[in-house]
């Protein structure tokens, strides 16, 4: 796998690998237009979550504010669904025993925001 | 910051860290309504890069198909804006000299999606 | 540091053409949205043609009126504008810059923007 030597090479000793300090391109931003969670014909709300022990300790989750899409009229659509669009991250979780300080990853689904879609069924008419 | 050591402890030799193998939640997948993109009123496709000394190797990129949205009767309406919805997510970079192994995490900006917004302005009457 | 580099302004009779080249560099060009804007003597910058991620979709000032055309070339990293049946009032010059959001994106809240290339149409 990704994370294994090379066959040829001997064995990681105790099950860890080397993670160099520092991260590629840190100081990237999200560049997102304006307010476009309340904006949008499907708009969303966000709930922060806050861990100290987790890189990056602030992950951000969208909720659907509504189950159909909003209108030119500013009322709710029903036959249009408002629906989360969710992206798989990694996120690195530190673990510490006195000075002894290990890190590992894990996956994180987070829901990044919401979009207006076509039903494929119709339950409400 | 995040990856450093408590100062009473002695520092990390060769600026380097211990990162467990495995990753928590591996298995945990995105489950999203089916084909969301094509049905969305700011639909999107997806482009793929794939680079073996990442990981994840695969990574996803969304672009939004019009620059307004699709109304119901399937036209385009340009007094809505379709926008990109992005994500910061963090990927692994694997560099390898020989037996010699390490890893550093990468922050790489997500097009995750698009979604349908009333404009700020009105570029286009 | 995202580099514009206009070119292919000039002096042109009413009713000639020009093709407008921008090339960009410096970030992923397909992940853009890109836009053409014009500065016309004494006035404010305007909008005047945008072309969508995939470059499938493209929408145009009402001032435009068919006469221009925006194409882009990722490969080459460049966005052109095909403009014909010039008028003395596109007198300009003319700017080139992604439009990370599309249409929803506000010129006010641009950091940056290439030296631009003057087109000038008079008999």
């Known amino acids: 796998t990704f994370f294994q030597k090379p066959e040829s090479c001997p064995p990681v000793p105790g099950g860890s690998m080397k993670l160099d300090i520092g991260i590629i391109n840190e100081n990237q931003r999200v560049s997102m237009s304006r307010n476009i969670e309340s904006r949008s014909t499907s708009p969303w709300d966000y709930t922060v979550t806050w861990d100290p022990n987790r890189y990056p300790s602030e992950v951000v989750q969208a909720q659907c504010r509504n189950l159909g899409c909003i209108n030119a009229q500013g009322k709710e659509d029903i036959s249009m669904n408002s629906v989360p669009i969710q992206q798989e991250t990694l996120v690195v979780r530190r673990k510490h025993q006195g000075c002894s300080v290990s890190f590992q990853l894990e996956k994180v689904l987070v829901t990044v925001g919401c979009t207006c879609v076509t039903p494929v069924i119709h339950h409400v008419q | 910051t995040f990856f450093q050591k408590p100062e009473s402890c002695p520092p990390v030799p060769g600026g380097s860290m211990k990162l467990d193998i495995g990753i928590i939640n591996e298995n945990q997948r995105v489950s999203m309504s089916r084909n969301i993109e094509s049905r969305s009123t700011s639909p999107w496709d997806y482009t793929v890069t794939w680079d073996p000394n990442r990981y994840p190797s695969e990574v996803v990129q969304a672009q939004c198909r019009n620059l307004g949205c699709i109304n119901a009767q399937g036209k385009e309406d340009i007094s809505m804006n379709s926008v990109p919805i992005q994500q910061e997510t963090l990927v692994v970079r694997r560099k390898h000299q020989g037996c010699s192994v390490s890893f550093q995490l990468e922050k790489v900006l997500v097009t995750v999606g698009c979604t349908c917004v009333t404009p700020v302005i009105h570029h286009v009457q | 540091q995202v580099q514009l580099v206009e070119s292919g302004g000039g002096l042109v009779q009413p009713g000639g053409s020009l093709r407008l080249s921008c090339a960009v560099s410096g970030r992923t060009f397909s992940s853009y949205a890109m836009g053409w804007f014009r500065r016309p003597p004494g006035k404010e910058r305007e909008f005047v043609a945008a072309i969508s991620w995939s470059g499938g979709d493209t929408k145009y000032a009402d001032f435009v009126t068919d006469r221009f055309t925006i194409s882009r070339d990722d490969a080459k990293s460049t966005v052109y504008l095909q403009m014909n049946s010039l008028k003395p009032e596109d007198t300009a010059v003319y700017y080139c810059?992604?439009?990370?959001?599309?249409?929803?994106?506000?010129?006010?809240?641009?950091?940056?923007w290439g030296q631009g290339t003057q087109v000038t149409v008079s008999s």
């Open positions: 810059n992604d439009m990370p959001y599309g249409l929803d994106t506000r010129m006010d809240e641009y950091e940056y």
